[in-house]
Interface confidence: low
């Protein structure tokens, strides 16, 4: 799996999970989240050569097409596969609210 | 929806469906498929600015992050959303076989 266990241990140009810490205030301009101040969102990036963690038959076809037609603009892309939620604390007036924001943290990647 | 009805009618730099015809023999080196000789596979490409057809909360966060941090390499990517199968005819010896290959045709795109 193209997850932290594999990707953070290896120097990998191909599609892999990349570390990314996001500070809510500085990076997103969000001032409404009280806790946490930021989180490890991570992101997916890298090339998608033939059969590198292809998600669908179409992405396999596209990567093979790209191998045979390297001048083409069509190629698969490295995107998130498994995502996890993030629990946040914010206030409505003086009332604290705890909420779970779904699909906030990328755990693994795929070529799609 | 970022489908043919919208994308093939508009000049669109952002994430959209792009036409792509694949010839099995020429483009993939596949000689085993008897019919069809090729098909309209299509592909997804284009930029993913903030809120442009974002797939998940993470992709929305990433596109906003990319807007505020334009020098960053972290950004969502334009990938396939809805896919359709393709029916093919091939031979095992002299016996014709009809099979449906799943997820072969891209019908719409998303930023993920």
């Amino acid at each position: 799996a193209l997850d932290a266990a594999y990707c953070f241990r290896n120097v990998q140009d191909n599609c892999c999970l990349r570390p990314l810490y996001i500070d809510f205030k500085r990076d997103l301009g969000w001032k409404w989240i009280h806790e946490p101040k930021g989180y490890n969102a991570n992101f997916c990036a890298g090339a998608c050569p033939y059969l590198w963690s292809s998600d669908t038959q179409h992405s396999r076809v596209l990567s093979l097409y790209n191998t045979i037609n390297p001048e083409a603009s069509a190629s698969p892309c490295c995107v998130s596969q498994d995502l996890e939620p993030l629990t946040i604390l914010y206030y409505i007036g003086k009332t604290p609210k705890i909420e779970q924001l779904s699909n906030m943290i990328v755990k693994s990647c795929k070529c799609s | 929806a970022l489908d043919a009805a919208y994308c093939f009618r508009n000049v669109q730099d952002n994430c959209c469906l792009r036409p792509l015809y694949i010839d099995f023999k020429r483009d993939l080196g596949w000689k085993w498929i008897h019919e069809p000789k090729g098909y309209n596979a299509n592909f997804c490409a284009g930029a993913c600015p903030y809120l442009w057809s974002s797939d998940t909360q993470h992709s929305r966060v990433l596109s906003l992050y990319n807007t505020i941090n334009p020098e960053a390499s972290a950004s969502p990517c334009c990938v396939s959303q809805d896919l359709e199968p393709l029916t093919i005819l091939y031979y095992i010896g002299k016996t014709p076989k009809i099979e449906q290959l799943s997820n072969m045709i891209v019908k719409s795109c998303k930023c993920s």
Epitope: D13, C15, A45, G46, A47, C48, P49, N66, P70, E71, A72, S73, S75, P76, C77, C78 | V11, Q12, D13, N14, C15, C16, R18, A45, G46, A47, C48, P49, S73, S75, C77, C78, V79
Partner: antibody
């Protein structure tokens, strides 16, 4: 036929600004990345930057800040805005299309084809 | 940032000679093969000869060939023709570098 043609070159004083245009035909700017490359008289080629099919611009470290690449897909044109020009910016400026555009931000084929004929920019007082 | 060093910077040769030009990169090019070769004649834009280190561009004579991987690359002209007298440049594509591309300094091939 796929073509690129640069325009907008000429004589400009040091400290001045200039905007070059690259008119493309035969292909869509929505599907291909276009680069700017320059060549000082009698010297080698120097990559300036590119604008991707999706509209993201990347620059050589020396060009960041003074040079800006943009495009108007409806007009089939790519632009290079050059500010605070210096004598050492005197060069022929070429636009060149990528042969390949991938969806990943990690690399490309370094294959530029086709090229425009170039436009000469002279920075002198 | 990556630097490409070409050698020799100039050479004199006769029609029919075998000519070899080398290009050395200070860091590995992307995918070990994102290296191109260009030919340029006075007053003209460069012409793409070879991409992907060894793939000949359509219409380029077979006397041109490219080889190498990672950091060391070679352009060979097996039998020099009158129209081959020109300046040759290598260009590399890089991952994780602030400069995505770099050109070599050029090699001028002159008539002996």
């Amino acid at each position: 036929e796929q073509q690129l043609v640069e325009s907008g070159g000429g004589l400009v004083q040091p400290g001045g600004s200039l905007r070059l245009s690259c008119a493309v035909s035969g292909f869509s700017l929505s599907s291909y990345t276009v680069n700017w490359v320059r060549q000082a008289p009698g010297k080698g080629l120097e990559w300036i930057g590119y604008i991707s099919y999706g509209g993201s611009a990347y620059y050589a470290s020396w060009a960041n800040g003074r040079f800006t690449i943009s495009k108007d897909s409806a007009k089939n044109s790519v632009y290079l805005q050059m500010n605070s020009l210096r004598a050492e910016d005197t060069a022929v400026y070429f636009c060149a299309r990528h042969m390949q555009v991938g969806g990943a931000p990690t690399g490309s084929m370094a294959a530029f084809d086709p090229w425009g004929p170039g436009t000469l920019v002279t920075v002198s007082s | 940032d990556a630097q490409l060093t070409q050698s020799p910077s100039s050479l004199s040769a006769s029609v029919g000679d075998r000519v070899t030009i080398t290009c050395q990169s200070s860091q590995s090019v992307y995918n070990n093969n994102y290296l191109s070769w260009f030919q340029q004649k006075p007053g003209k834009p460069p012409k793409l000869l070879i991409y992907g280190a060894s793939t000949l561009t359509s219409g380029v004579p077979s006397r041109f060939s490219g080889s190498g991987s990672g950091t060391d690359f070679t352009l060979t002209i097996s039998s020099l023709q009158p129209e081959d007298f020109a300046t040759y440049y290598c260009a590399g594509g890089y991952s994780g570098s602030s400069d995505k591309y770099a050109f070599g300094g050029g090699t001028k091939v002159e008539i002996k």
